[in-house]
Interface confidence: low
Amino acid sequence: SQVSQNCHNGSYEISVLMMGNSAFAEPLKNLEDAVNEGLEIVRGRLQNAGLNVTVNATFMYSDGLIHNSGDCRSSTCEGLDLLRKISNAQRMGCVLIGPSCTYSTFQMYLDTELSYPMISAGSFGLSCDYKETLTRLMSPARKLMYFLVNFWKTNDLPFKTYSWSTSYVYKNGTETEDCFWYLNALEASVSYFSHELGFKVVLRQDKEFQDILMDHNRKSNVIIMCGGPEFLYKLKGDRAVAEDIVIILVDLFNDQYFEDNVTAPDYMKNVLVLTLSPGNSLLNSSFSRNLSPTKRDFALAYLNGILLFGHMLKIFLENGENITTPKFAHAFRNLTFEGYDGPVTLDDWGDVDSTMVLLYTSVDTKKYKVLLTYDTHVNKTYPVDMSPTFTWKNSKLPNDITGRGPQGGGGSENLYFQ
């Protein structure tokens, strides 16, 4: 049956998929609040532009009877069920916001006509790359890969004088949705990251990771993992670590490192944290007051999805163009719009660009400090601290190949029991 779009005659509707399975376990009420806050802003912006139109959102809930795992495991079918619900209602908005799970987005993209845009807070996996009508408002795995390759190759900074070509990747299969797809991309033999590295091994057991920390026969000094400090501590504890080990902790959606009173714990001294540059504080907004940092990013992506739609609607209406055309569906890319927290840039494929920040722990102040930033839009690294107070010898990052630099030694101090 033909689905009509409620998207003309001065009335424009946004279809928001409220899926029980999502990339982050966020109460749907909080996402509704984010969407509603976005709608208020969009209405104000359109009114200021002299456009007297109505913009609303329809929240489409899945039944939650079959697909109720709460994470992304059973999301493929849930997405299709919601599409079926839209089809049965024969009613669709101008744009589809959600889903956030890679599986469901991929499947929904395959099973939908390309006549309307899809905006996702998530869909991190490589399988959602280069989709003509899909926009992703949280950093996808491709962006992470490009940073890592860029950083590995860098050898002309005062604190990094070696190019790296090797890595271990710790991936035990219990990661959060974002981490799962980030590490999946690094693991994939066909990915850019794998192509650019000479050696890469995935560590799947806690013991494998723990053994590498002091293994004199290790093939790389660099270990990539994904999660927060708590995750690392429970894995690494207070174990001794060879002095040329560098752990890259990918923790993009966590702005707690930038809070004033945060002291970096001892176990973080061998760690470089990759996170996103924090935006302006969202704590005063009604939708985010009670959200954790990760969830602020997730809710913010929903809100920014609404603002993006408003931005495109305004442009098309001012130009007298039809909203229900493939041109509109394909337009949500290669642009910058005013997001809730500042300008948001989308690349040629509709993926959000951002400033990634690499942090280190200062041995002097025990604070997290910015080592460098990386602009995903131009694929360029900008050093910030030219004289970092590293734990590593000579305040330089070591070579990635064991045996070419100083080696650690001594006994292991286990967190739990000696």
Epitope: T174, D206, S292
Partner: antibody, heavy 122, light 110 residues
Framework: EVQLVESGGGLVQPGGSLRLSCAAS????????MHWVRQAPGKGLEWIGE????????NVHEKFKDRFTISVDKAKNSAYLQMNSLRAEDTAVYYC???????????????WGQGTLVTVSS | DIQLTQSPSSLSASVGDRVTITCRAS??????????MQWYQQKPGKAPKLLIY???KLASGVPSRFSGSGSGTDFTLTISSLQPEDFATYYC????????FGQGTKLEIK
């Protein structure tokens, strides 16, 4: 309301087994570490072990490793303590508690269940 | 394990008294500028209740007459002016390496 409720205690013979449950409500279960702590009659508190619901990581004190296993059912927001080869000295009130790690790395047991009594006797 | 020794094991005091309980760890529980030491209150037949975390930080909802101090291996819980509801057993706990508790201090009415 944040709440932990233990169940499954009772009288068991030496050498027997028992499975204790801890039902969590009022908070995001997967964001915590869930712990089991016991207290023998008239004695102090003794930590048994912990589990991270979202990842299934467990750490059990060496003293209990061979006999006690900790597990979770995320769908039910519940943690479990499986106790095998029980001895008279395992007679105690068993508490379920949680930790939430702060950015600064503090760990503390901020919420406790009411406890469930396990009596091992013939 | 890190061993914790509380003193005294028991203590008699009156309402309005200032009371101090100490806890000594077998090794330092300091961790990058923080001391991972907690204090709990337990009444008969009830679960323990968190009073102090990170040596000196007052847990939510705990009266300000309770305070904690110390660093490294030596820690103190102080009740500035005893109230009738404060008579209970108090435990220290470290979370520096795994989790261990002191043997407890029973605070009784004189």
């Amino acid at each position: 309301e944040v709440q932990l409720v233990e169940s499954g205690g009772g009288l068991v013979q030496p050498g027997g087994s028992l499975r204790l449950s801890c039902a969590a409500s009022g908070f995001t279960f997967s964001h915590t570490w869930m712990h089991w702590v016991r207290q023998a009659p008239g004695k102090g508190l003794e930590w048994i072990g912990e589990i991270k619901p979202s990842r299934g990581f467990t750490n059990v004190h060496e003293k209990f490793k061979d006999r006690f296993t900790i597990s979770v059912d995320k769908a039910k927001n519940s943690a479990y303590l499986q106790m095998n080869s029980l001895r008279a000295e395992d007679t105690a009130v068993y508490y379920c508690t949680r930790t939430i790690t702060t950015t600064q790395g503090y760990w503390f047991f901020d919420v406790w269940g009411q406890g469930t009594l396990v009596t091992v006797s013939s | 394990d890190i061993q914790l020794t509380q003193s005294p094991s028991s203590l008699s005091a009156s309402v309005g008294d200032r009371v101090t309980i100490t806890c000594r760890a077998s090794e330092s529980v300091n961790w990058y500028g923080s001391s991972l030491m907690q204090w709990y209150q337990q009444k008969p037949g009830k679960a323990p209740k968190l009073l102090i975390y990170a040596a000196s930080k007052l847990a939510s909802g705990v009266p300000s007459r309770f305070s904690g101090s110390g660093s490294g291996t030596d820690f103190t819980l102080t009740i500035s002016s005893l109230q009738p509801e404060d008579f209970a057993t108090y435990y220290c706990q470290q979370t520096r390496k795994a989790y261990t508790f002191g043997q407890g201090t029973k605070l009784e009415i004189k």
